[in-house]
Amino acid sequence: KAMHVAQPAVVLASSRGIASFVCEYASPGKATEVRVTVLRQADSQVTEVCAATYMMGNELTFLDDSICTGTSSGNQVNLTIQGLRAMDTGLYICKVELMYPPPYYLGIGNGTQIYVIDPEPCPDSD
């Protein structure tokens, strides 16, 4: 039993540096505790952007200082990443882990390419 994770191929961040995408997983079992992690892949380096563990039916709780927020509905997680700048353009991978009850399952999406364009500074008005 494999766990498939789906996410959009491309997302364009808003002019305010906010990007949202859906991460959907096909659960092989009846998980009550799920961990969702957003990873950023740059070249061959993979780093954690944010992570949240949630009980099915409850809201995702990211750490207070996290740049991510999210909501869950069944096997679907709506993720929002804030504070993005042009230099943050890259591949963002959704990783899902079914933590409880056993058995543990791992699922990794193919990644969402998030494009971030810094807004042009407003010209001074005389």
Partner: antibody
Framework: QVQLVESGGGVVQPGRSLRLSCAAS????????MHWVRQAPGKGLEWVAV????????YYADSVKGRFTISRDNSKNTLYLQMNSLRAEDTALYSC???????????WGQGTLVTVSS | EIVLTQSPGTLSLSPGERATLSCRAS?????LAWYQQKPGQAPRLLIY???SRATGIPDRFSGSGSGTDFTLTISRLEPEDFAVYYC?????????FGQGTKVEIK
């Protein structure tokens, strides 16, 4: 750089207990799942146990379930394996390994040898 | 439990030759890794996700396969490649390893 250093191994009699430690450095310990893997002399690798992130979720191999307990102290960046009711077949080199961001065991310690013998 | 069976048990080859190692799973595997272990050393991650090379691994190492059949290929054996190689599945618990393939100098 990432470093994992095990300690606590030694020679112990069957039925006795031993506690292994794995000191981690060079990464944010609480963000990673941590595994124990063992290797009997001249044999292959055998997964023993894993503990996830905040320490609430743990899984064990059937061969050690009920006898071994995995734990972690994120404030000390240390992983533990409490081994009770030891048997001759538990004799092995015990290594800790980090579960990388994408799942595989990307860093391993050199291991600590446990010998169970009367 | 997913059982991984590696073949052959031992592979006798000369430096410069191509090595092909097989790993077969008892049921479909979603995530597979390959490790290299030299005597007295800890295992080293070579390949993850069946075909992605780990950081710092030379491109003579390549992985392929899906489902139940996986292959590790070393295109041209270097003296330092003679070691034991293990496959591992990490997509579900319990985590399991193959019994290993020893690549020795002919």
């Amino acid at each position: 750089q990432v470093q994992l250093v095990e300690s606590g191994g030694g020679v112990v009699q069957p039925g006795r207990s031993l506690r292994l430690s794995c000191a981690a450095s060079g990464f944010t310990f609480s963000r990673y799942g941590m595994h124990w893997v063992r290797q009997a002399p001249g044999k292959g690798l055998e997964w023993v146990a894993v503990i996830w992130y905040d320490g609430r979720n743990k899984y064990y191999a059937d061969s050690v379930k009920g006898r071994f307990t995995i734990s972690r102290d994120n404030s000390k960046n240390t992983l533990y394996l409490q081994m009770n009711s030891l048997r001759a077949e538990d004799t092995a080199l015990y290594s800790c390994a980090r579960a990388g961001e994408l799942g595989p065991f990307d860093y391993w310690g050199q291991g600590t040898l446990v010998t169970v013998s009367s | 439990e997913i059982v991984l069976t590696q073949s052959p048990g031992t592979l006798s080859l000369s430096p410069g030759e191509r090595a092909t190692l097989s790993c077969r799973a008892s049921q479909s595997v979603s995530y597979l890794a390959w490790y290299q272990q030299k005597p007295g050393q800890a295992p080293r991650l070579l390949i993850y996700g069946a075909s992605s090379r780990a950081t710092g691994i030379p491109d003579r190492f390549s992985g392929s396969g899906s489902g139940t059949d996986f292959t590790l290929t070393i295109s041209r054996l270097e003296p330092e490649d003679f070691a034991v190689y293990y496959c591992q599945q990490y997509g579900s618990s319990p985590w399991t390893f193959g019994q290993g393939t020893k690549v020795e100098i002919k």
